[in-house]
Amino acid sequence: GSERTCCPVNWVEHERSCYWFSRSGKAWADADNYCRLEDAHLVVVTSWEEQKFVQHHIGPVNTWMGLHDQNGPWKWVDGTDYETGFKNWRPEQPDDWYGHGLGGGEDCAHFTDDGRWNDDVCQRPYRWVCETELDKASQEPPLL
């Protein structure tokens, strides 16, 4: 595929990545799928500056990111190492709370109203952020 050198229309460029901010809500898996269909992934936060950039754009609204522990340990959707990477959980989080009455615990991470992270039920219809890296080979065939 060809290298992407600029962001698609309606995406925002920042530090060699492109971001798309939803204005509607979806369950985490549907948001994840939406980003994949756009040749992107749910946002992976690798620094405090990236955290603040995303916060600036989403405002104080619960918003999914590309972090989950549905298969045990916490994992970023692009393979970024969770243990050694940037983390910004709210105090006392993640807590895998079972008291919500929806069945199971809490396996998907989202930005909260103050920007810090919380784990929540993956079926909740939150907004989401897609990210794709510039200079990454896109899946589209080159124009002949």
């Epitope: 603040k52 983390k87 920007g115």
Partner: antibody, heavy 119, light 107 residues
Framework: QVQLVESGGGVVQPGRSLRLSCAAS????????MHWVRQAPGQGLEWMAI????????YYADSVKGRFTISRDNSKNTLYLQINSLRAEDTAVYYC????????????WGQGTLVTVSS | DIQMTQSPSSLSAYVGDRVTITCRAS??????LNWYQQKPGKAPKVLIY???SLQSGVPSRFSGSGSGTDFTLTISSLQPEDFATYYC?????????FGPGTKVDIK
Amino acid sequence: QVQLVESGGGVVQPGRSLRLSCAASGFTFSSYGMHWVRQAPGQGLEWMAIIWYDGSNKYYADSVKGRFTISRDNSKNTLYLQINSLRAEDTAVYYCAREDPRTSCSDYWGQGTLVTVSS
Amino acid sequence: DIQMTQSPSSLSAYVGDRVTITCRASQNIFSYLNWYQQKPGKAPKVLIYAVFSLQSGVPSRFSGSGSGTDFTLTISSLQPEDFATYYCQQSYSTPFTFGPGTKVDIK
């Protein structure tokens, strides 16, 4: 009400070390990041360091990296600043301040403690 | 590091005057711009955070505006208690640098 009280300042010789403390009350200390900011006599404000609510992340001004250490004891509601190899240019009023978690601004400040480095 | 500049460095004004202080960042800091007021011998206090949000208890004559790299603090009608030094600060990227300050005194 939120209260921050710094202590530990005084006159100290160049090359010595000092540990400043900041006692916090009136809020859940363990839920907030904390800053140190200093102000040399007659000069402006200089941001020094921040520590996250649980101590997991610490960031410093380039000018003091390796010489200053920020730490906290949440069981004592106390913030610390360890200053090593003191220099004349470290003479300043040192303020602790609470971090607003959304914006990182300093929303509450202590009254400051004066450190004078002199032989 | 992000550099913050302020202008003017000092100004003299009458009670009742409209006063404007500008702050410029060396790169985009989005909405992470805060304004502080400091009186002699006292600790600073936050007036405005996130460009235009007024801190609780701060009079409405203070307002903030701007975006990206250029920001403004406005005092709509200067009061005797407003004579002080004003600092802007970016809290986007560490180190969280302050501007050099603007001293507002009585004409």
